[in-house]
């Protein structure tokens, strides 16, 4: 399937040029998306190009500015948040990144009714997290690991927690491992729907071992960064959930929510919290051995001012073939009766589908079914359920939005997006206004991304919000590579792949091949999305063929493929990349003496193991920030897929699956190893151990470190990195500079 056909007019050939590395590093061909900041059923806010905050009314077609760029600039604000009562806006400045999601910032409150900043009882700085209540203009914020509450922006704060302590006790914000591997947010507090209650998590990291690394900076002595970071098998954070009445916070204080007995009997995690009503809350818990999850629905007891979680409202989700859920355990979407809910989990055939749970999980009614997967439930209204799936035309790397009418019987299903812009758009997400009165569709490709606004009743397109016209014009004289997405059938396994081909690709010629791999559990690399990136340049300018392959362990194709890697990381992911390479060679246009593989993070692990597989297939390869031993990585992630590194569990495979164990096999390949010294996620330790093993085995290799850079290798390091990797590959493939 050719997704981006090259232009056919020969007269244009002379004016067309290939992509350059500079194009990629400058972000010349980056695209824009438009996500409305909904404030009602028919209104949204958007930050204009000149930085005014503008309110749009879909029904009148009118818009007006509620906050000027002058006010934004006066405090150097880069972000904003309107209070639900529309009286105040918080302005966020002095953004300072911490980990993947977390950052600190300074916050100012602007009073829209009076056109001035709120003076008196200003917020402290820097704040770790701040949010409005869902109704009115109460504020909850986290400062120095403690939670504070303001009834109004100008009021003095009420301190809710007092035990917060850096790197020890975290209130309302996650510690490192919960942020990265469980919650995937910078916050751990949740307002009830009308703002009556505030729920929050407390993480106790007192007994967690600390990872320490040097941050060189430019002082005479380097700083040491210390992070409580539980590696596989280590002591984990202890979590507790509390709820406080925000109307009378001092009355009974925070009340702890009980943990289900079957969870509390051994090490466990809290995985998410979902408010149902102001007086009903749903908590999800997970055993440390992550194949049992419990969803617990708790009710407020007015007489005792406590939260009661009856056993009859506990729903167990268990996997017998792998871990619970996909990457995370899915969260419930409650219906209007405030007790039944919709949830995605594996059906009897091993495909993730939407189920409706009214009383027990055993009696769940399956809403979707087929040899494809439901991926996300966007919204449930009185009469419709909107979700995304990869059902259409059996391409797992697509995402379309569907509507199921739940108000009628039998429920009818309609694909909202499948035929809208079929060639251009095959990978969508959506954003819904209150009651799904309107929604925005954001199409990520395979053509140039486009964002559109739609009527929630008729699905009619109302207007284009962003169509990336400038990008389209800029690409008119660029020779983009061709892309195709196809599949290989090997030993009852379907291997989907994306191939990126040089613009003048000729099947009768031979091309160097670069495999780009990630391959982590529940990931997907072969997606129908638009991208002009480094590999686009390598195909366009340097004439390489690039391939991405989704092997065993990857997502959205059923549990058989997903859970194949359970307790055996580093085996089948590598095998499947190798199998695919052999199939590509058979296609006849690959120069088998010029094959390389590269990957980042989990992909660095897979590329390292592939290079050390002893197959002789790869001439060279690159590992950026690789995991080298699962004993070095985070407990929550690693144990989900590998169990524990103990003798009576899975220690043997932990030991067998290291990169270091294969040091000897790197002798006949050119290996480039790259890592940031301040990587908080995959610690530099991983590459240090690879390097040590290679030195001890007297194996030559190349390496590059990036001082004080984290797992993302951002800023100027990005330019240096891609320039360096380009030189390495061109040398490997004997391409002239």
């Amino acid at each position: 399937i050719v997704l981006r056909p090259s232009r056919v007019h020969n007269s244009e050939e002379n004016t067309m040029r290939a992509l350059t590395l500079k194009d990629i590093l400058n972000g010349t061909f980056s695209y824009k998306t438009f996500f409305p900041n909904w404030i009602s059923g028919q209104e949204y806010l958007h930050q204009s190009a000149d930085n005014n905050i503008v309110l749009y009314n879909i029904e009148t077609g009118q818009s007006y500015t509620i906050l000027s760029n002058r006010t934004m600039k006066s405090v150097n604000a880069s972000n904003y948040g309107l209070s639900p009562d529309r009286q105040f806006v918080y302005l966020e400045s002095d953004y300072s990144k911490l980990w993947r999601y977390s950052y600190t910032a300074t916050y100012y409150i602007y009073d829209l009714s009076n056109g001035e900043f709120v003076r008196g009882n200003e917020l402290p700085r820097p704040i770790q997290y701040l949010c409005w209540s869902p109704v009115g203009s109460k504020l909850a914020y986290v400062y120095q690991n403690n939670i504070y509450l303001k009834q109004r922006p100008g009021d003095p704060p009420f301190q809710i927690t007092f035990n917060g302590r850096e790197n020890k006790i975290f209130n309302g914000i996650p510690d490192w491992v919960y942020e990265e591997e469980m919650l995937a947010t910078k916050y751990a507090l949740w307002w009830s729907p009308n703002g009556k209650f505030l729920a929050y998590a407390e993480f106790n990291d007192t007994d967690i071992p600390v990872i320490a690394y040097s941050y060189y900076g430019d002082e005479q002595y380097p700083r040491t960064i210390n992070i409580p970071y539980p590696k596989a098998g280590a002591k984990n954070p202890v979590v507790r959930i509390f709820i406080i009445d925000t109307t009378y916070p001092a009355y009974v204080g925070p009340q702890e929510v009980p943990v289900p007995a079957m969870i509390a009997s051994s090490d466990y995690y809290f995985s998410w919290l979902t408010w149902v009503t102001d007086e009903r809350v749903c908590l999800q818990w997970l055993k440390r051995v992550q194949n049992v999850s419990v969803l617990s629905i708790c009710d407020f007891r007015e007489d005792w001012q406590t939260w009661d979680c009856p056993k009859t409202q506990e729903h167990i989700e268990e996997s017998r073939t792998g871990w619970a859920g996909g990457f995370f355990v899915s969260t419930p979407v409650f219906s209007y009766d405030a007790i039944s809910y919709y949830k995605i989990f594996s059906d009897k055939d091993g495909y993730k589908h939407i189920h409706y749970i009214k009383d027990t999980v055993e009696n769940a009614i399956q809403i979707t079914s087929g040899k494809w997967e439901a991926i996300n439930i966007f919204r449930v209204t009185q009469d419709s359920l909107f979700y995304s799936s990869n059902e259409f035309e059996e391409y797992p790397g697509r995402r379309n939005i569907y509507r199921i009418s739940i108000g009628s019987y039998p429920p009818s299903k309609k694909c909202v997006t499948c035929h809208l812009r079929k060639e251009r758009c095959q990978y969508y997400t959506a954003s819904f206004s209150d009651y799904a009165k309107y929604y925005a569709l954001v199409c990520y490709g395979p053509g140039i991304p486009i964002s559109t606004l739609h009527d929630g009743r008729t699905d009619q397109e109302i207007k284009i919000l962003e169509e990336n016209k400038e990008l389209e014009n800029a690409l008119k004289n660029i020779q983009l590579p061709k892309e195709e997405i196809k599949k290989l059938e090997v030993d009852e396994i379907t291997l989907w792949y994306k191939m990126i081909l040089p613009p003048q690709f000729d099947r009768s010629k031979k091309y160097p091949l670069l495999i780009q791999v990630y391959g982590g559990p529940c990931s997907q690399s072969v997606r129908s999305v638009f991208a002009v990136n480094w590999i686009s340049y390598l195909a366009s300018k340097e004439g390489m063929v690039i391939a991405l392959v989704d092997g065993r362990g990857t997502a959205f194709q059923g549990d058989k493929l997903l859970y194949a890697v359970y307790r055996k990381l580093g085996v089948y992911e590598v095998e499947d990349q190798i199998t695919a390479v052999r199939k590509f060679i058979e296609m006849g246009f690959i120069d088998e003496k010029r094959i390389a593989i590269w990957g980042w993070s989990y992909g660095g692990y897979v590329s390292s193991l592939a290079l050390a597989s002893g197959t002789g297939l790869f001439k060279c390869g690159i590992a950026v920030a690789p995991v080298s031993s699962w004993e070095y990585y985070a407990s929550v992630y690693t144990e989900r897929f590998m169990g524990l590194p103990t003798k009576d569990d899975n220690l043997e495979h932990y030991k067998n699956s290291t990169v270091m164990a294969r040091a000897e096999y790197f002798r006949n390949v050119d290996y480039l190893l790259i890592h940031g010294t301040a990587d908080d996620n995959v610690h530099f330790q991983n590459s240090a151990q690879i390097a040590k093993a290679l030195v001890n085995a007297q194996v030559d290799f190349q390496a590059m470190w990036y001082s004080d850079q984290n797992h993302g290798l951002s800023g100027l390091s990005t330019n240096h990195l891609y320039t360096h990797m380009t030189h390495f590959l061109k040398q490997c493939f004997s391409l002239s500079d």
Partner: nanobody, 117 residues
Framework: QVQLQESGGGLVQTGGSLRLSCAAS????????MGWYRQALGNQRELVAG???????YYPDSVKGRFTISRDNDKNTIYLQMNSLKPEDTAVYYC???????????WGQGTQVTVSS
């Protein structure tokens, strides 16, 4: 130029009622969310009620259950029914867009409400 004309204020005893009206010029009124605001002497202006084009309403806790906002789209008018009035409700009452538009110089004159004890 957009015009907003508030009326219906007056002097009332504690526990009494008043109904305020605000006539707005059509272009701004039609389909937009509107609000009633008040400003007591020496205090900041504050919202007392908001209504969106589809009739969704909002009230702060201080007036919830006592005040009711409504709109008549045909007459380009919004109303504020105020019951069980208290001395602390004494203020000048204004109507405007909700939230207000910046540089929107047409906050009206307002209408004075005085609640005596």
């Amino acid at each position: 130029q957009v015009q907003l004309q508030e009326s219906g204020g007056g002097l009332v005893q504690t526990g009494g009622s008043l109904r305020l009206s605000c006539a707005a010029s059509g272009s701004i009124f039609v389909g937009n969310a509107m609000g009633w605001y008040r400003q007591a002497l020496g205090n900041q202006r504050e919202l007392v009620a908001g209504i969106t084009s589809d009739g969704t309403t909002y009230y702060p806790d201080s007036v919830k259950g006592r005040f009711t906002i409504s709109r008549d789209n045909d007459k380009n008018t919004i109303y504020l029914q105020m019951n069980s009035l208290k001395p602390e409700d004494t203020a000048v009452y204004y109507c405007n867009l909700w939230p207000p538009r910046i540089g929107f110089a047409s906050w009206g004159q307002g209408t004075q409400v005085t609640v005596s004890s």
